[in-house]
Structure formats: C-alpha cells, structure tokens
C-alpha cells in the first residue's frame, strides 16, 4: 500500500522542515522539577516499541509506522545500558536497583549494592541503597507505585525494598533460615520500610494470612492469603494513616480517587499479577491508565509535589510466553497511561521519563508490506516451503517440532491472541535481551537525558531534577508554580 | 565475575554524578557546520551496537559492557523510524534515499520518490530527489564516499544515483528494454551524475569492459570487467580532472592520500564488495579506518569544507549470513573509523552523525555471566537438553535440523568466525528488522538530533546545519575558523 500523498517529495520535505522547526525551538528548562514520574515498560526494548507503534496505529485504521505513540512525543532520548554487575543480560530486580536507586546490583537482588549476593540473607545488612522515591518522601513529596504486576514484584519493589531474593514476595517464600536471620519478605517491606501514599496493582495474596479467602475468588484456595506469620498487612497499613483506604475493585478505586478524605490509597486488584489487558474484566479491574489517573488525582494534592512509578509490567510476561499479541497490547495500554498522565500533568513542573528495564529476544522482520498486520506472515515462504511470521523470538516456548519439522502457520493462526511466535531455541520461558533500551524524557531537566548512559543515570537525573539527595545543592530555580 | 570496585555504591554514584556534570555542561553550538560526516552502519541495530560494545571491550581485556564505543561518546541520540513507503521493514536502497536525500522511497529503489516503482524504468524521470552530498558539492564543498561494500551498492548510491533497481550495478545488470528507455546503471551514474572528489571501496568489475582482467585476480574471469558498453569508466573519470588518481591497493592509497598533487581520488580495492575485516589482506586492501583517514586528508584541504559518507557496509552481510562474528567484527572496524575521524576533525566545525539504515532480527539473550564471550553459550540447557548460544536470529540460514532435531553446540563451535547462529525460521538470507535505529550526533547543530524522528530527518539536519538547500537562509553564525 503506497499512500498517494507520500509519493510527493513535498510531503517528506515539509514534514522534516516542521520537525526541524520543533527541534530548533526546544529550550532546556532551567527550573527544578516539582513532580517526578517514571514510566517503566518491563521488557519494552526498541523492537517492542516499534511493533507497538504499528499496532496502535493500525487500531486507529492507519497503516501503522507513521503514527506516534505518546512516548514518541517526548523530546529527549537516550540509550540506557542495562547489564547488571554480574550478568550481561539482566533481570528486573538488578535493573530496578539501577534506575530507581542509582546503583547497579546483582541478578535477582533488589535495592542492594553488588556487595550483596543472591539468596544469601547475611549479605543484606549494610548493603542497602536508597531509592529516589524514598528520598522524595523524605523531602516532603507524596509518592506512589502503580503496576500491572503484583506490587511486590521486582520492578516496583526497587522503589521501597531491599532483598537478596526477588522471589520473597511473602514470608511463605522466605526460607526459615533467612527469616531467622532477620530477612523480611517484600510485602512486609512494602508497608514498613517507608510511607507510600498510593499503592496500586496486584498482589493481594501476599498481604493476608494463609487461609484468608480472596474476595474475588473466595472458592479458589490457591488465590487466598499466603502469609505464615498470621499478619494482615493491609490492616496494619490502614492503621498507620487516618485517611488510608484499601480497595480491591475498579468501582471502589474510582470512588476513592475522587474522595478528598482519602490521603493514602492501596488498591490490590488481583491475588497475583493483574490480568493481561485483553483478559481484563473491566467491571472489576481497572486498567493501567485508570490506576495512573487515580494515583495522579491523589498525589497532585501535595503542594510539594510527588514521585510516581508507573509500570507496564506484563509486557515482559507476554514476551516470556512468546505471545507477542499479549506483549504488544500491554505496551499499548502502557502508552495509553503515559498519554493520560500527560493530560493530567504539566511539563512545566513535571519531569516524566519513559524507559524499559531490559529488552527481549523479540524481532520484527521479513519485509512485510506497509499496512499489513504486525501479527501476520512475511511475504513468500521459508526454505522449508512453509510460511513464517514477521514477529519471531530468538528463544522461548514457541519452538515446536511437528513430525520432526517446523510447523507451518496461517494468517489466522498467527493473529490469535494465544499464538506463540516460533523461536530458534526451545525454552520454557523466553529470555530477556541485553541490548540498550531507550529512555524518553520530557519536562524540567529532561535535556540531561542524552547520549548513551548507564541505567543508573536515570535515578540520578530524577534526583538532580527535583533537588533530592545527594543533589540538594542542585542550584536550580524553583519549579514553576511551586507553593513552597 | 563481579568487579570488586563495582560492589561499592560510591562507584556508581560517582560515575553518575560525573555523567550528570557532563550533561549539564552540554552547550548547543549556534554555529553552522563547515563539514558534514555521516557514518552509516548498514544493518547496525541497537542489538548490534550493544554486542559490538561488549566484544570491543573484551578485545581490550575488559569485561565488556562497561566500555565505550566511539559512537557511545557522541552527546546526542535520537531514534529513527526506518520503514519505507511500501514496506514496514525496509531495504538499504529506500533507506539511503531517506537519510541522504530527505525523502522516503519504495523498497529497492534509490534516489527516487515513492512515485517511482521498483524495476519500472519509465517511472524514473521526474521523480529524482537530490542528495545532501550533491547539494554540498553545489555549495563548493568537497565530497566523498567511503564504503566496505562495492561503491555502487545501495547505501553509497543514495548519495549520487537515481535508479528504480538497486541491483543495476553495471549495464550488464540492466535489462535491454530499460537501457533503451535511457535508464543508466549505477556505475555510470557514479562518474557522470556529479563530481565526487573521493570514492573509496569495492566495485572494480563494474567499471571496466567485459573481458578486462582484474589486476588482483587476473586469472579469475568472474572477477574481471562486466560492462557490455565497452566503456572504461575509471579512464573516463580520470580524464575529467587533472589531479585525479585511481588506486587499487593499500600502498597506493596511503601514498595518494598524502600527495598534495592529488585532488580527486578513486580507490577500488576489490572486484565486488571488499573482504570482511577478518579476511582482509592488510598488505593489499586498506581497512575502513584507513580509507576514512585517506578521505579526510584529501577533503579537509577545501577551506569551504566537505561532506563525507562512510559506510560499514558489511555489518549487514554478516547478519544476512547469520554469522554474528563477521557482523560484530565489521561493527568494531566501523567504530574504529569513527574514532579515527574524531582524531582528524574538530567538533567545533564538523557535524558527525552515526546511524544505521535498518536493523536485523538479531538478539542477545540467555542471561550470560558478565565477562563471558559474546559468542558463547547461555548458562544451562534448553528444553531439548542441548546447549544454546546467547546470540540468535529470528530467521536465517543458521536454522538446521539434524536427525529431525535442533543440533547441539559447543563453546568452541560457537566461537568460530564461520559459525552461523541458529534461527527460528530457515531462510537463505536472514532478513532486516523493522525496529527504530539509533542516531548519534556530535558537532554544530547536533542538538537538533532528538526524540523519535522519521529517517528523512537526518538529511534535513545535515542540510540545515551546513546551510545547504533548502536551508540556505539557515540564520546560523558562520562556523568557527571559516575562511570563506
């Protein structure tokens, strides 16, 4: 498909001249940021961004790649080096430590320097590193965590927890020896390490004692509370704040977000991770966009500003399953959340960053025609005379041999939300990839986001922009509209 | 491997504070660019950049990812959308039209708007678009093309040619009907469309009449001249300029580049593409770095400045073969050329851009330990109880079934320069990928390189920075040190 207007050189020349005009007008803001938002697309490498752009465009009846994601509109871009201290290809724990605390750690540890060792409880103490969210709270800002995974998952945990094992969600996941040594599960740390004003996502079961039925799935024992210590962490959290409210469904969330008496809000909408956007029951569970809006409504009441972490956490899960449909629809909802946040905040006083913790071995090739489905087949046949998809994985569960050969695939099969794209190597879970990821930035001090940087740089830019530790002597003009 | 200094948070905090300091010091230059250099890594997607960084670091006895490529030091980064008008995943012809002429074209066409149709000669006339190199020449600058492919290949051809078929290297490749309609082969256009001061790369055979033996391979008929029109294009080119010199080996090149009597230089070092860096005979063929240096020595004599195109063109070929070793060693030589150019030019007066035309379905996953070989195996086994490499392809010739199953692989096999990484789909040639690629920028007006842009933006930034058409009213201060 060749759009007739694109045949004319004037189309491209005009468009580029406009882009140049916009680039020339870019003026680095010399003010500090009152508010900080970091949008984290878990596993959202550049190949995922491009494929999601095309899908989002096609959902709007466009050809695809010429359209803009919300993140595409951010004026500054850098590349972030995601390796952990011990691995070329990292996990979401070590990377969360990097972009939220400004220090690189080891694979599967969270909120700890690399002096800590995975799974070795006795290497925790003294190696804790403090997140920008924590520093923002100490500076009088309101803070929030929003995710489509469980709120105790690796990425959000980087904002508040310190653990040698990212899988220690509740005390039931922590070995007795580690509990005796004083290592706390992540759910406990969520409510006790610091005062978080807004907590929205999944992860109900880790907050309640074993045997507590889940409100949404009361008959499913596997979805109920998991805690061995008998604690009801939600109750403990509510007791800490007079204006605290706990919600577990969409209706309650929307009410609470508009209620001026609510000062602290915890919303846990699933026992574990939230459902994929394509499976979400919109009467019961809010979307990432709705959770982001709710968080912003509460947090923006603070005249000193806020810090907000928003994670599209299941992009990663879709990729691990080699189900690109899931990964890309999650990415679109993540982008919708970015767009909505842009409508609710001002780039005069809010530094917004969009990035990924790491990428995936996910590729988009095969010379498909413009306008063809991102989930479709490449033109022509492979060397084995069978069709193949434009989306593929380097490794993962999509590898299948049928009668000792690669299976054929039809357009209708490949377009199914359940379809697993093929891979070169059979694994139970497709792996992360180690290439640099993009960082998109908008707002005060966004111009500092440039070039190729260590992933740790992200935390430091946020801290500097808002004059938080260790940059309290930041020498920036107060942000516009500050009431301090 | 955990470097002991990296265990200390101070290591990361100090490093990030330094990076922040450097970011704060960045001052957009308000001057025009006297010189323009575009470094084009053909097929150099972000995954290739990261893998090459690790390899280059390990060749210097470092762990790898913490090191810097020369391009990593460029202060500004953008993402470039590479689709062609008719394809989600482009080729090197349509993309060359975009980044060199500022207009998107159709798959496999060069220097033509999308009103032209692949292989249809009669759609050529009237649809030509003019490259920035051509505009630089008209403005009195010296211009050069350097590549490791044949100089008539798609990417360099974007600087000087207009053709509906990128494969029309010599007249022998052009159908008689198209020749009768007046469509010229690319080699003819190389010497007749415009005056190029420096031409360095491969592609001897397209310049000489059929039956002319090649000077390096006189006994190999397949390497000799291919032209049907009986023309000796080298002779024709030499006749145009009193100070013109033609060379075909490294020694002659190095002599000519230092000879003040040489005003125009053509060096064609192989009949077709130049050899991969790992196969190069350094007594006969220059490296990309040496060709770049030779070009700069000649071009810098012009007080009005120069335009130089430098292509690491065989990164792409290594990937098409699914031989990552070749692709990555080519990328390192490309980066060495960037580094050398940085030693021979000043960022006060030279805008240097580094980018790729497109990516490849090449991934780097599997959670390898830091410091482990980029060509090595992932820890653990796949679901079929066999080893697998961290580098893999989505599709390509590395797909093999042995007795109806995926073959096992050892570390020594995977480290071989000839090893083809496995892929999900068997193809004769691995395909390009459609995700955004990075643009790195340094020098006057480099700050305009920001955000997510169409690939066409690159040509426009170059034209604007040097006040070339259509931006002659650029309103920029003359560059530092100009003698005009």
């Amino acid at each position: 498909i060749i759009p007739v207007e694109e045949e004319n050189p004037d189309f491209w020349n005009r468009q580029a001249a406009e882009a140049l005009g916009a680039a020339k007008k870019l003026q680095p803001a010399q003010t500090a940021a009152k508010n900080l938002i970091i949008f984290l697309g878990d596993g959202m490498g550049v190949s995922t961004v491009t494929a999601a752009r095309i899908l989002k465009g096609q959902k709007k009846d466009k050809l695809g790649p010429e359209t803009f994601l919300a993140m595409d509109r951010f004026p500054y871009v850098a590349l972030s080096k995601t390796y952990s201290v011990d691995k070329h290809v990292p996990d979401s724990g070590a990377t969360a430590t990097a972009y939220l605390c400004g220090v690189k750690g080891n694979f599967q540890t969270i909120g700890l320097s690399a002096a800590a060792r995975f799974n070795q409880c006795n290497t925790t103490r003294g190696n804790e590193v403090i997140s920008v969210m924590n520093r923002a709270k100490k500076a009088g800002k309101s803070v929030g965590v929003v995710t489509t995974t469980r709120v105790q998952h690796a990425s959000p945990a980087g904002a508040y927890a310190h653990t040698v094992n990212r899988n220690w969600y509740s005390d039931a996941d922590v070995p007795a020896s580690a509990r005796q040594e004083g290592c706390q599960d992540i759910a406990t740390q969520l409510i006790s390490n610091m005062d978080i004003d807004v907590i929205l996502g999944g992860g109900r079961k880790y907050m309640f004692p074993m045997g507590t039925p889940d409100p949404e799935y009361p008959d499913d024992y596997s979805q109920g509370g998991t805690r061995l210590d008998g604690k009801n962490l939600v109750q403990e959290w509510l007791a800490k704040h007079q204006g605290a409210r706990y919600v577990w469904n969409r209706t309650e969330l929307l009410q609470a977000s508009l209620d001026p008496s609510v000062t602290h809000l915890m919303g846990l909408f699933e026992p574990g991770d939230m459902k994929y956007e394509i499976h979400r029951d919109s009467t019961l569970d809010p979307s990432l966009m709705e959770m982001t809006e709710a968080a912003l409504l509460l947090l923006s009441r603070n005249p000193r500003g806020f810090f907000l972490f928003v994670e599209g956490g299941r992009i990663d899960h879709g990729h691990h399953e080699s189900r690109a449909y899931r990964a890309l629809t999650e990415t679109i909802m993540f982008d919708d959340a970015i767009e909505r946040a842009g409508q609710l905040t001002s780039e005069e006083d809010t530094l917004s960053l969009v990035t990924a913790d790491h990428s995936h071995v996910f590729s988009f090739g095969g010379y498909p025609l413009r306008g063809s489905s991102i989930f479709g087949l490449a033109p022509g046949k492979a060397r084995d005379r069978k069709a193949y998809t434009v989306l593929l994985y380097g490794n993962g569960p999509g590898y299948v041999l049928k009668d000792g050969a690669r299976p054929d695939v039809t357009e209708s099969e490949s377009g199914s939300p359940e379809y697993r794209q093929q891979s070169a190597v059979p694994l139970d879970g497709e792996t992360h990839a180690g290439e640099d990821v993009a960082v998109f930035a908008r707002g005060p001090q966004a111009h500092l986001v440039h070039g190729v940087q260590e992933q740790t740089f992200i935390a430091h830019v946020m801290a500097f922009a808002a004059c938080l530790e260790p940059y309290t002597a930041c020498d920036l003009a107060p942000r516009a509209g500050t009431t301090d | 491997i955990i470097p002991v200094e990296e265990e200390n948070p101070d290591f990361w905090n100090r490093q990030a504070a330094e990076a922040l300091g450097a970011a704060k010091k960045l001052q957009p230059a308000q001057t025009a660019a006297k010189n323009l250099i575009i470094f084009l890594g053909d097929g150099m997607g972000v995954s290739t950049v990261t893998a090459a960084r690790i390899l280059k670091g390990q060749k210097k006895d470092k762990l790898g990812p913490e090191t810097f490529l020369a391009m990593d030091r460029f202060p500004y980064v953008a993402l470039s959308k590479t689709y062609s008008v008719d394809k989600h995943v482009p080729d090197s012809g349509a993309t060359a039209t975009a980044y060199l002429c500022g207009v998107k074209g159709n798959f496999q066409t060069i220097g033509l708007s999308a009103a032209a149709r692949f292989n249809q000669c009669n759609t050529t006339r009237g649809n030509e678009v003019i490259s920035v190199m051509n505009r630089a020449k008209k403005a009195g600058k010296s211009v050069g093309v350097v590549t490791t492919t044949r100089v008539q290949h798609a990417s360099p051809a974007g600087a000087y040619a207009h053709t509906v078929n990128r494969n029309w290297y010599s007249d022998a490749d052009v159908p008689a009907s198209a020749r009768q309609e007046g469509c010229q082969d690319i080699a003819t256009q190389l010497i007749s469309n415009m005056d190029i001061d420096v031409i360095l790369g491969g592609g001897r055979k397209y310049m000489f009449p059929m039956g002319t033996p090649d000077p390096e391979y006189p006994d190999d008929y397949s390497q000799g001249g291919t032209r049907l029109d009986g023309k000796n294009l080298v002779q024709e080119w030499l006749a145009k300029h009193q100070g013109a010199r033609y060379v075909w080996n490294r020694t002659e090149l190095l002599q000519a580049s230092l000879d003040p009597s040489v005003t125009h230089l053509m060096g064609l070092f192989e009949p077709g593409d130049m050899k991969y860096e790992i196969h190069r005979d350094s007594t006969l063929d220059p490296s990309l770095m040496e060709m770049t240096e030779a070009a700069l020595l000649l071009l810098s004599r012009n007080p009005r400045g120069f335009f130089l195109f430098v292509e690491g063109g065989r990164i792409d070929h290594g990937h098409h073969e699914s031989r990552a070793y070749r692709a990555l060693t080519e990328t390192i030589m490309f980066d060495d050329a960037i580094e050398r150019a940085g030693q021979l030019t000043s960022e006060e007066d030279t805008l240097s851009l580094v980018t790729a035309d497109h990516s490849h379905v090449f991934s780097f996953g599997g959670y390898p330990l830091r410091g482990s070989s980029i060509f090595g195996l992932a820890p653990g086994k796949a679901r079929d109880r066999k080893a697998y490499t961290v580098l893999l392809y989505g599709n390509g010739p590395g797909y093999v079934l042995k007795d109806g199953a995926r073959p096992d692989v050892t570390e020594s096999e995977s480290g071989s320069p000839e090893y083809r990484q496995q892929s999900a789909v068997p193809l004769d040639g691995e395909t390009h990928a459609g995700e955004d690629v990075a643009v790195f920028a340094r020098g006057p007006q480099a700050h305009l390189v920001h955000g997510v842009q169409e690939q066409t933006f690159i040509a426009h930034v170059m034209a604007f920075a040097a006040c070339l058409e259509p931006y002659t009213a650029c309103d920029l201060a003359p560059r530092a040190g100009t003698t005009d």
Epitope: - | K60, L254, L258, D259, P260, S282, S287, M289, E290, L297, S300, P303, D336, E339, R340, G342, Q343, L344, T345, S346, E347, E348, D349, A480, G481, T483
Partner: antibody, heavy 117, light 111 residues
C-alpha cells in the same frame, strides 16, 4: 589512572645508538598515535615523529630525523624510538605524548638523553 | 612547516590580559589544527587549547584560542600568578606525510 612513562634515557658517547620506550598504563595504545618530542636544555620543544598505533604502525618523522630515528609499536602498551648516530646536539629530554581527537592530551614526564664523550 | 611565535618575554600584571600570536608558514591541516601548550620548568607541556579554539578538559575559561588558516592567537584574560610559564603553539599539515611543528615558545612573566 591513565599515564605514559618514558624509559631508556642514558649517557652515551657520540655515534652510539639508543632505544627509548614509552609505556602506557591504564589504557592500551590500540586507537591512538604516540608522538615523540624533545627539548634541549634551556630550549624549546621540537617534534621528532609519530607512530600510528592503530593501523600497521605507520610512522611519520620530521625531515631532520628521517634515517637516524625510527619508531615502532612493540606491544599494546609500548612504543619505542630507536636513535642512531647520536651527536651532542641530540642531548635533550625526550617526551612521548598521546594524540587523540582532543589534542595531545597525555604526556610522559620525560627521560634525559645525554650525548657526551 | 614553520611556526613563528610572539617573541619572549611578554609581561602582564595580575588581572590583566596577555595575547600571544602564532603564525604558520602555510595553512594548517583543516585550517584549524593548532594547539597551545603551557610548560613550567622541569614539567612536560600541558595542553590548553586544541583545534585552534577548543578548551582542553580542566583548563580555566580565562584561556581562549582563536584564528584560522595561518594566523592564530592565545589570549589569557584575568592573568594569575601561576600563569607565568612558557607557551608553545603546535601546528600540523599533510603533504607526503604528516608534519608537526612547535613554535619557538613565548615566556609570560607576571608582575
């Protein structure tokens, strides 16, 4: 800490030969030029020559030095300057320096060569 | 290639300005391959300016380089006591090889 250090300076008789070595620490020479400069007592700086350590060790020497002085890269961290037929006029402190895109940024402390009978 | 510098010595008062010129016998490489160095007795030279006008890392902005082709200038403003040293220019050109040449040096005396 990136450093260069010259060694091999000595007291020699006229007509003798001498080899100076420039050793890099904290970095490798694989992407730089290394240049030699000398300074006679109480006099100015004088360029001797440069070795391109990246390619095949191409060398460039001042016209007065050609024939008597040669340079080579001996490892990824060392280059040498070979000097023959030395005379009293060659008495000087000899410096090596790293040439990058940012100029001659790193210099060694120098080594003294004295030619005297 | 011959580089000719302002004769020595040049004197300046603390807080004053010093200008040193350097002329090359032919245009330097790229019209701007010229560097300025500061040298104190018993020390190796220290790079101040490269590419005619670019300030080297860690050098105070009081040092300014200008010029193109064959005429170049080093200006030191707000002269300090520790600016007392000998200053050298270094030029390069390419003709059948790379050639570099230092100027004869200019001693700056600070009063």
């Amino acid at each position: 800490q990136e450093q260069l250090k010259e060694s091999g300076g000595d007291l020699v008789k006229p007509g003798a030969s001498l080899t100076l070595t420039c050793t890099a620490s904290g970095f490798t020479l694989s992407t730089y030029w290394v240049c030699w400069v000398r300074q006679a007592p109480g006099k100015g700086l004088e360029w001797i020559g440069c070795i391109d350590t990246v390619s095949s060790g191409d060398t460039y020497f001042a016209s007065w030095a050609k024939g008597r002085f040669t340079g080579s890269k001996t490892s990824s961290t060392t280059v040498t300057l070979q000097m023959t037929s030395l005379t009293a006029a060659d008495t000087a402190t000899y410096f090596c320096a790293r040439r990058t895109g940012s100029g001659w940024t790193l210099w060694g402390p120098g080594t003294l060569v004295t030619v005297s009978s | 290639l011959v580089m000719t510098q302002t004769p020595s010595p040049v004197s300046a008062a603390v807080g004053g300005t010093v200008t040193i010129s350097c002329q090359s016998s032919q245009s330097v490489y790229n019209n701007n391959y010229l560097a300025w160095f500061q040298q104190n007795p018993g020390q190796p030279p220290k790079l101040l300016i490269y590419w005619a006008s670019k300030l080297a890392s860690g050098v105070p902005s009081r040092f300014k380089g200008s010029g193109s082709g064959t005429q170049f200038t080093l200006t030191i403003s707000d002269v300090q006591c520790d600016d007392a040293a000998t200053y050298y220019c270094l030029g390069a050109y390419v003709s059948n090889g790379w050639y570099f040449a230092f100027g004869g040096g200019t001693e700056v005396v600070v009063k």
